[in-house]
Interface confidence: low
């Protein structure tokens, strides 16, 4: 999906209003020095992409993240601020809405949450950058 | 054009050292899960070390574990593998991978054109 | 370990005609989070391998619509719906589902 014609405000107030809080409380217990945060981003739809790509592909190291509140919440957000959007992810998501709910949250997928704190921290500057 | 190409390969005899690098180019080198598989000649592909993007967590093949190291460099788009006390059975073509995590569901999308490492006295 | 076992080891394919190669794990690749960790990768003589299909039965970018994967659990089958030259080489399944990442032997495809 390109996400050149999203609308980046919309989805930044969203962010900052609930997906934050979300993703926050989900890496609650963890120092912010506990991993290192390597992922980046060069401009708004790239970021998007990226965030797109580690909060919902799968991986058998971290299952359960597209199950998660702020995974719900972010495909909302794109849904409604990305036209066309969420025609491209009905395939992409069928196996997700079958998957069962976990409640254990694990180290490995901590390490994946950290760096989607700093694909949206990212996000919002190159926002602020170009106004 | 994204490219992944090895270097560091050559001859080394057996208990001796190697260190293989992996140069990474066109996409997000620190975005991604990076795989070493290496191919002895005429036989299939066997999976060596992978290592998540943030270096968190790495994991071995059995059958290096305890001699080789994988690392990688973020700030450099590099990926490393250190292979110590080497032998014969290690004689292999080594490819850098990118893959092994969340992109593609684990598999191993983008390949370097590999570099041969020959074990002998 | 998970063992992938590939068959037929070789194969010899008319232009045109289609081809069929299994690949059976010694245990079922399918995750709690419904996705099956099974892909597929060509390696065309002289070359490295590539990723044709992924999770199963998605293609890779730029793989052409003829070959496609299919399959659950245990068994996987990748089909060629019309071989064509450029597809003779040696393919692999792997799964990816736990460490050790395993390979099956590979088959090889041959022009007749």
């Known amino acids: 999906y390109d996400f050149t014609n999203c609308d980046f405000q919309k989805i930044e107030a969203d962010y900052l209003r609930t997906i934050s809080k979300d993703l926050i409380t989900y890496m609650s217990g963890t120092k912010s020095t506990d991993f290192n945060n390597t992922v980046s981003c060069s401009n708004r739809p790239h970021c998007l992409t990226e965030i797109q790509s580690l909060t919902f592909n799968p991986t058998p190291r971290c299952a359960s993240l597209a199950k998660e509140m702020f995974a719900r919440k972010t495909k909302a957000t794109l849904a409604l601020w990305c036209p066309g959007y969420s025609e491209t992810q009905i395939n992409a998501t069928q196996a997700m809405k079958k998957a069962r709910k976990s409640k254990v949250t694990t180290n490995k997928c901590l390490e994946q949450v950290s760096q989607l704190l700093g694909l949206w921290r990212r996000f919002i500057r190159t926002l602020l950058k170009k106004q | 054009e994204v490219q992944l190409v090895e270097s560091g390969g050559g001859l080394v005899q057996p208990g001796g050292s190697l260190r293989l690098s992996c140069a990474a180019s066109g996409f997000t080198f620190s975005n991604y899960d990076m795989t070493w598989v290496r191919q002895a000649p005429g036989k299939g592909l066997e999976w060596v070390s992978s290592?998540?993007?943030?270096?968190?967590?790495?994991y071995y093949a059995d059958s290096v574990k305890g001699r080789f190291t994988i690392s990688r460099d973020n700030a450099k788009n590099s990926l490393s593998l250190q292979m110590n006390s080497l032998r014969a059975e290690d004689t292999a073509v080594y490819y850098c991978t990118r893959g092994g995590g969340a992109y593609y569901g684990g598999s191993l999308d983008v390949w370097g054109q590999g570099v041969l490492v020959t074990v002998s006295s | 370990d998970i063992v992938m076992t590939q068959t037929p080891l070789s194969l010899s394919v008319t232009p045109g005609e289609p081809a069929s190669i299994s690949c059976r794990s010694s245990?079922?690749?399918?995750?709690?989070?419904?996705?099956?960790?099974l892909h597929w990768y060509l390696q065309k003589p002289g070359q490295s391998p590539q990723l044709l299909i992924y999770?199963?039965?998605h293609r890779a970018s730029g793989v052409p619509d003829r070959f496609s994967g299919s399959g659950s659990d245990t068994d996987f089958t990748l089909k060629i719906s019309r071989v064509e030259a450029e597809d003779v080489g040696v393919y692999y399944c792997e799964q990816t589902l736990q460490t050790p990442f395993t390979f099956g032997g590979g088959t090889k495809v041959e022009i007749k």
């Open positions: 290592i998540t993007f943030a270096s968190s967590y790495i």
């Open positions: 999770l199963v039965s």
């Open positions: 245990q079922s690749l399918l995750h709690s989070n419904e996705y099956t960790y």
